[in-house]
């Protein structure tokens, strides 16, 4: 039975040209995390694997950095980076947990961080 919960940074906003950290945290389960995939819509951004370390997809290498922790740092943000991001936790024996983050990249300096929320 899947008992875990993913907490994410929720809905966030950032300034064009700036950077942002996408973070997810899996709690309330003893399952071991085999791998975390970061995806934007259906595109793979990065992988963090327990045995093999980090992989950043070639098309994002220049603007995506691993960490902190299992999170992901997006740099040199553009308006095109606005959208949904998913952290997909592949765990054993529970299975797959998915967290969602919505990022809005703003032209001006009105960017403010949204509240945290939980996905069961």
């Amino acid at each position: 039975m899947m008992t875990g919960t993913i907490e994410t940074t929720g809905n966030i906003s950032a300034e064009k040209g700036g950077s942002i950290i996408l973070q997810c945290h899996l709690s309330s389960t003893t399952a071991q995390v085999t791998q975390v995939n970061w995806e934007q819509q259906d595109q793979l951004l990065a992988i963090c694997n327990a045995d093999l370390g980090w992989h950043i997809s070639p098309s994002f290498k220049d603007r995506v950095a691993p960490g902190p922790g299992l999170g992901l740092t997006l740099q040199s943000l553009t308006v095109n980076d606005t959208g949904e991001y998913f952290c997909i936790y592949h765990t054993y024996p529970d299975g797959t947990y998915t967290g969602r983050i919505f990022l809005e990249v703003l032209e001006s300096s009105v960017a403010e961080h949204g509240a945290r929320f939980q996905i069961p």
């Epitope: 071991q32 793979l44 370390g53 992989h55």
Partner: antibody, heavy 120, light 110 residues
Framework: EVQLLESGGGLVQPGGSLRLSCAAS????????MSWVRQAPGKGLEWVSL????????YYADSVKGRFTISRDNSKNTLYLQMNSLRAEDTAIYYC?????????????WGRGTTVTVSS | QSVLTQPPSASGTPGQRVTISCSGS????????VSWYQQLPGTAPKLLIY???QRPSGVPDRFSGSKSGTSASLAISGLQSEDEADYYC???????????FGGGTKLTVL
């Protein structure tokens, strides 16, 4: 369609060397962990080696450690296996295999194999 | 000798249900995923089951996988003559940091 095509097999004397290649197509090669698996005549399957996405992490079976080197060229979508100090017991069909996006799930696509014969 | 243990042979008649076992340890089967492969004579292995009990698209639902503790099983129901092949279980071994295969089971359809 996902395809793997091995080449480079042949007849070699004990103590000799061979380099096997595996040309990949139909998927984003950079995003997948790859392995070599072999099968001696009339025997079962034996995993040989594994390489992560950019080649900075490799693992080997004890039977080939120190003699075989796995590598990849992502710009050419090609996986390699450099085989040195070959022995009669290395005679086998060598298959290259693509892993699932979560590599611990196993290998989802295999090539047809290339035959290596070590004999004087 | 293989790290994972499978019976060398199994057999059944058309329409029957056959089960092939695979025995391992805490560092592989018990705490990791298991895959099953079918190898028809003279061909490359083909994936049947991954993630212990998941079937890739295109694999008939006659094939199913299960796992309990340090053992895994592949069940084939409604056995057909074209199922005659070698079957292998595989798991990533966390201690050895290597893929470990079973020795293979030769299935004969009588």
């Amino acid at each position: 369609e996902v395809q793997l095509l091995e080449s480079g097999g042949g007849l070699v004397q004990p103590g000799g060397s061979l380099r096997l290649s595996c040309a990949a197509s139909g998927f984003t090669f950079d995003d997948y962990v790859m392995s070599w698996v072999r099968q001696a005549p009339g025997k079962g399957l034996e995993w040989v080696s594994l390489i992560n996405w950019n080649g900075d992490k490799t693992y080997y079976a004890d039977s080939v450690k120190g003699r075989f080197t796995i590598s990849r060229d992502n710009s050419k979508n090609t996986l390699y296996l450099q085989m040195n100090s070959l022995r009669a017991e290395d005679t086998a069909i060598y298959y290259c295999a693509k892993h699932w996006i979560v590599f611990q799930y196993g290998m989802d696509v295999w090539g047809r194999g290339t035959t290596v014969t070590v004999s004087s | 000798q293989s790290v994972l243990t499978q019976p060398p042979s199994a057999s059944g008649t058309p329409g029957q249900r056959v089960t092939i076992s695979c025995s391992g340890s805490i560092s592989n089967i018990e705490t990791k995923y298991v895959s099953w492969y079918q190898q028809l004579p003279g061909t490359a292995p083909k994936l049947l089951i991954y993630n212990s009990d998941q079937r890739p698209s295109g694999v008939p639902d006659r094939f199913s996988g299960s796992k309990s503790g340090t053992s895994a099983s592949l069940a084939i129901s409604g056995l057909q003559s074209e199922d005659e092949a070698d079957y292998y279980c595989v798991s990533w071994d966390a201690s050895l940091k290597s893929w470990v295969f079973g020795g293979g089971t030769k299935l004969t359809v009588l």
